[in-house]
């Protein structure tokens, strides 16, 4: 907190300019009018203020706007945004995507800070849903943004926004998140032809059910092993050897290297050994010939 002192003669700021970088903290407090600062916020970012000085300028704005800054000021905060606390940001009403972009730009290249997370949360809640333009913007600045949302939050993403999602945006998503995103992606891409559809849907397949995987196996998609390994185990288990062979195409040979890992390991345990042998990969651990598998109320019994 800077103590109140009278502004020295001749030092009263007439405008926000570079001369202010030479003001001591108490002089900034005494000589810069908060209303002037608010109307000329667009100049602050171009002036090499220290963060110590920005603290003083923030204090002045806080006094002028105790209920929260108007968007006209927020849009031009620039580096002053880094001085805001999540509590400050919760008082704001940010509606313009341009304002959001301007503030995200300040933090570009750095991890998502609590301030940025709060800003995004306020913005998205204000809009009511994650529309395509917002999602485009957020994933451009933070590729992992989508996977930081809970399944409940992801449910507000309209299918049309899925077009903005790139494969790398889903890298850190867990199965629960993909369960929510996959049906949206399926809806979004439903009018595409086979090969184009697969290219788009591929990164969402960790949320696909068995019947969709069966359908894909009929389309010569040649799924790579990395995608196959991300599929839901419960969706892979009912697939036949023939279906997996069709689904993977030439990549089927990769099963051998993954035979000890889920979901391949669990799938092998469910297949007849003689069916596995038809692949010629030396996969072991299937059900011996002559054995019958009964599925009694979700419990497997071997007889």
């Amino acid at each position: 907190e800077v103590e109140k002192t009278a502004c020295p003669s001749g030092k009263k700021a007439r405008e926000i300019d570079e001369s202010l970088i030479f003001y001591k903290k108490w002089e900034l407090e005494a000589c810069v009018d908060a209303a002037l600062l608010a109307t000329q916020m667009d100049r602050v970012n171009a002036i090499p203020f220290t963060y110590e000085q920005l603290d003083v300028l923030k204090h002045k704005l806080d006094e002028l706007y105790p209920q929260g800054y108007p968007e006209s000021v927020i849009q031009h905060l620039g580096y002053l945004f880094l001085k805001m606390s999540p509590e400050d940001i919760r008082k704001w009403n940010v509606t313009s995507l341009e304002t959001l972009k301007a503030l995200l730009e300040v933090n570009k290249g750095h991890e998502m800070s609590p301030q940025v997370a709060t800003l995004i949360d306020r913005f998205v809640k204000g809009r009511g849903q994650l529309d395509k333009d917002t999602l485009d913007t957020l994933t451009a600045f933070y590729p992992g943004y989508l996977c930081s949302l809970s399944p409940e939050e992801l449910s507000s993403v309209p299918p049309s926004s899925i077009w903005a999602v790139r494969p790398q945006d889903l890298d850190t998503c867990d199965p629960r998140q993909l369960d929510v995103l996959y049906p949206k992606a399926r809806l979004a891409f439903q009018n595409m032809n086979g090969s184009e559809y697969f290219v788009k849907i591929q990164s969402f397949l960790g949320g696909a059910p068995t019947e969709d995987l069966k359908a894909l196996s009929q389309q010569n998609v040649s799924m790579d092993l990395a995608t196959f390994m991300k599929l839901r185990t419960d969706a892979v288990l009912p697939l036949t050897v023939a279906e997996v062979q069709k689904l993977l195409g030439p990549h089927v040979e990769g099963l051998k290297a993954e035979e000890r890992h889920r979901p391949v390991r669990d799938w092998i345990l469910r297949q007849r050994q003689d069916d596995l042998d038809t692949l010629g990969l030396g996969l072991q651990g299937g059900i011996p010939n002559g054995y019958l598998v009964l599925d009694l109320s979700m419990q497997e019994a071997l007889s």
């Epitope: 090499p48 220290t50 963060y51 580096y79 880094l82 001085k83 750095h110 800070s113």
Partner: nanobody
């Protein structure tokens, strides 16, 4: 994190020159601008000169025409060339880097100008 180490201070006669150096290390890419500040005992630190990442320089009125701030990107060093020194230039000179999202300061180097 950004680390700053000043050197070059000392005792000189009025009218003589000194060159201060500030070696910069750490997350240099996050730096927006750098400056030299000085502090007299019992007083608030005051800005002497600033240089931005694009090389724009700013000087306090009391050193204009006498001091020059510069930088050598290859050596990650910022300099303050001080000519025509006066007794009132005496103080501890601090190097400062304003980087994302805070100000970093060196430990300071003493400059004493005797008359």
């Amino acid at each position: 994190e950004v680390q700053l180490v000043e050197s070059g201070g000392g005792l000189v006669q009025a009218g003589e020159s000194l060159r201060l150096s500030c070696a910069v290390s750490g997350n240099i890419g996050s730096i927006r601008h750098m400056g030299w500040h000085r502090q007299d005992p019992g007083k608030e630190r005051e800005l002497v000169a600033t240089i931005t990442t694009v090389g724009t320089t700013y000087y306090a009125n009391f050193v204009k025409g006498r001091f020059t701030i510069s930088r050598d990107n290859a050596k990650n060093t910022v300099y303050l060339q001080m000519n025509s020194l006066k007794p009132e230039d005496t103080g501890v000179y601090y190097c400062r880097a304003t980087a994302h999202p805070t100000d970093y300061w060196g430990q300071g180097t003493q400059v004493t100008v005797s008359s």
